[in-house]
């Protein structure tokens, strides 16, 4: 591939398969568009990066939340 | 802390089938995936497959057809299957967690392997 | 399938720098190929160093770090000790599979 078409900050191969304690997630971001597949990528309490499914509900649930916060 | 083993039969007849199970701890498979990855005696290492959290899979495409990978997320076990074996299949089997970010090492705690040989 | 190409062996010495690389028949190694490096002790001991080009491992000495030198992926070891003896191995990342290299066997003279 190209260098122009790099992405230019975090992917991910696939999406975690648990719901996170709500309590856990301290942010977030989503990965670029240039990117193989969308992904939310929820940042914990203990620093762990998880990649998570942007169709699934409880992950828009937390993102929601997270922007209202 | 993560462990990952592998176990299985030894010695397989050629044109016979291989199941390697691969038991993990420390993590759950829910939030990983588990490459296999093999080895023949002297040689490099030959990238099998994976299977991610919500059971989805990657195959070497060379491999594909003879292929087939499954777990249990409450066993915290994941199975290799393997048909039609022969000679040059001899390796050193491994399996090995899989984070999902691609900011992490991809391949990132190894099984200590299971050794399989296919001989009559 | 790619072909990943590795230096076969290469040889240091105590608190040398020593660069590592990894080519691919394909073209250019990119950061869209997440390059990944594993070193491998005797009694078959793998231990995943490097991963996304540039990412250690926690716990890997800061020694050890990830690039991309012109259209190969390098693993450069800076002041290279004794105890990094072994084979390291290069996998890429093509889009739905990962392909190792051939390994480098690198000894370090002490």
């Known amino acids: 591939a190209p260098m122009g078409s790099d992405p230019p900050t975090a992917c991910c191969f696939s999406y975690t398969a648990r719901k996170l304690p709500h309590n856990f997630v301290v942010d977030y971001y989503e990965t670029s568009s240039l990117c193989s597949q969308p992904a939310v990528v929820f940042q914990t309490k203990r620093g762990k990066q998880v990649c998570a499914d942007p169709s699934e509900s409880w992950v828009q649930e937390y993102v929601y939340d997270l922007e209202l916060n | 802390q993560v462990q990952l083993k592998e176990s299985g039969p030894g010695l397989v007849a050629p044109s016979q089938s291989l199941s390697i199970t691969c038991t993990v701890s420390?993590?759950?498979?829910?939030?990983?995936?588990i490459h296999w990855v093999r080895q023949p005696p002297g040689k490099g290492l030959e990238w099998l497959g994976v299977?991610?959290?919500?059971?989805?899979?990657n195959y070497n495409s060379a491999l594909m057809s003879r292929l087939s990978i499954s777990k249990d997320n409450s066993k915290s076990q994941v199975f290799l299957k393997m048909n039609s074996l022969q000679t040059d299949d001899t390796a050193m089997y491994y399996c090995?967690?899989?984070?999902?970010?691609?900011?992490?090492?991809?391949?990132?705690?190894w099984g200590q392997g299971t050794s399989v040989t296919v001989s009559s | 399938q790619a072909v990943v190409t590795q230096e076969s062996a290469l040889t240091t010495s105590p608190g040398e720098t020593v660069t590592l690389t990894c080519r691919s028949n394909?073209?250019?190694?990119?950061?869209?190929?997440?390059a990944n490096w594993v070193q491998e002790k005797p009694d078959h001991l793998f231990t995943g160093l490097i991963g996304?080009?540039?990412n250690r491992a926690p716990g890997v000495p800061a020694r050890f770090s990830g690039s991309l030198i012109g259209d190969k992926a390098a693993l450069t070891i800076t002041g290279a000790q004794t105890e990094d003896e072994a084979i390291y191995f290069c996998?890429?990342?093509?889009?739905?599979?990962?392909?190792f290299g051939g390994g480098t066997k690198l000894t370090v003279l002490g």
């Open positions: 090995a967690r899989g984070p999902l970010i691609t900011t992490e090492v991809s391949m990132d705690y």
């Open positions: 420390g993590f759950s498979l829910t939030g990983y995936g």
């Open positions: 299977i991610w959290p919500g059971g989805g899979t």
């Open positions: 394909t073209g250019a190694v990119t950061t869209s190929n997440y």
């Open positions: 996304g080009t540039n």
């Open positions: 996998a890429l990342w093509y889009s739905n599979h990962w392909v």
